[in-house]
């Protein structure tokens, strides 16, 4: 006899990186017929919801209207059908950004390189932090972690046209509190036409949408959304 229900999916909208004082919604998708959902924060019950009518709803949204460092951390959710509870979801790391200062991002040898050249990004922040994060915008976003007293370097190695795109970096005061994002650096990698057609640039956002850290402007694919978050967040652990 089954003792627990399958774990729900958890993700944040518009993104798991939330500028301070902005709003974020934590979504928990379980099963139709679930009579109760619980959201746990750092191991303690944070919010409860009983969707109505349960047979027509398989997802609840927990709303955080005003993000701050107190709300940043690890969230998980569970749901109940009758008296049977689900396994807990994967952990969602909710990060507060726009804390304190803005780092500077630079690239060596420069923003325009030839395929095969070695490229290194440098993220610098003169305040008390020793961990830095480099993010590439786009659907298949990559997050890299680096360490250093005031600067971290991120060697990309010999680049290909797949490395083209817009990069930003953050200083991290702890796993869940990050600085303002740096100004963007757009990396242009030139290669032969055949390579370029095989490795199109990741879709990037218009500059104004980056402020809300949207993953993509038109994804309805919540599980893809959750999968991206999960991939990026593995670097936080």
């Amino acid at each position: 006899q089954q003792q627990t229900l399958p774990k729900p999916f958890i993700w944040a909208e518009p993104h798991f990186m939330v500028p301070k004082e902005k709003q974020v919604t934590i979504c928990c998708q379980g099963n139709y017929g679930a009579v109760e959902y619980q959201l746990h924060f750092e191991g303690s019950l944070f919010a409860v919801d009983r969707p109505k009518p349960p047979e027509r709803i398989n997802k609840v949204q927990f709303y955080i209207p005003d993000m701050n460092s107190r709300m940043a951390g690890q969230y998980s959710c569970i749901y109940r059908v009758g008296e049977l509870w689900s396994e807990p979801s994967n952990l969602l790391d909710l990060v507060v950004t726009e804390m304190y200062d803005t780092p500077t991002l630079s690239v060596h040898p420069g923003p325009e390189v030839i395929s095969g050249e070695k490229v290194t990004f440098y993220c610098r922040l003169d305040t008390a932090t020793s961990m830095f994060l480099l993010l590439k915008e786009g659907r298949s976003s990559h997050v890299q972690r680096g360490y250093g007293k005031v600067q971290a370097e991120f060697p990309l190695g010999p680049v290909t046209t797949a490395h083209r795109g817009t990069y930003r970096c953050f200083g991290s005061y702890n796993n869940h509190a990050w600085s303002f994002p740096s100004e963007p650096v757009k990396l242009l990698v030139t290669g032969d036409i055949e390579n370029t057609s095989l490795a199109p640039e990741d879709p990037t956002f218009p500059a104004d949408t980056w402020g809300t850290y949207l993953l993509t402007t038109e994804t309805g694919l919540q599980k893809d959304h959750a999968l991206w978050d999960h991939t990026a967040q593995n670097l936080l652990r």
């Epitope: 303690s44 919010a47 409860v48 919801d49 609840v60 709303y63 209207p65 107190r70």
Partner: nanobody, 129 residues
Framework: DVQLVESGGGSVQAGGSLRLSCAAS????????MGWFRQFPGKERERVAL????????FYADFVEGRFTISLDNAKNTLSLQMNSLKPEDTAMYYC??????????????????????WGQGTQVTVSS
């Protein structure tokens, strides 16, 4: 501005009953959460029972074990907590609180006290053995 005024506290023997009331005024939102929290000396406030006006949907702490019932009289804007089978360990200061719902649908409630922006002054409940 939102005002919450509790009443109904007092002293009672173990096994007895009390009914706490909280008169609410000034809340403009259609959906919101109200709750009863309690505080022991030197400790943080802990949730006792919550109710969401959109349901209304009720949520209880495990220690309540069916002994307490939270209810809301919308016509009178009064929140109540009927406490039966009281135990000496229920002795505490009881507070009424109000805050936003945890979802846009209005059917959920936050649990931590810091998510509630309006508080009453508290009413003391003392249960003697």
């Amino acid at each position: 501005d939102v005002q919450l005024v509790e009443s109904g506290g007092g002293s009672v023997q173990a096994g007895g009953s009390l009914r706490l009331s909280c008169a609410a005024s000034g809340y403009r939102s259609r959906h919101y959460c109200m709750g009863w929290f309690r505080q022991f000396p030197g400790k943080e406030r802990e949730r006792v029972a919550l109710i969401n006006t959109g349901g209304p949907t009720t949520f209880y702490a495990d220690f309540v074990e069916g002994r307490f019932t939270i209810s809301l009289d919308n016509a009178k804007n009064t929140l109540s907590l009927q406490m039966n089978s009281l135990k000496p360990e229920d002795t505490a200061m009881y507070y009424c609180a109000a805050g936003p719902p945890s979802s846009d649908s209005g059917s959920g409630c936050y649990v931590p006290e810091y998510m509630y922006n309006y508080w009453g002054q508290g009413t003391q409940v003392t249960v003697s053995s």
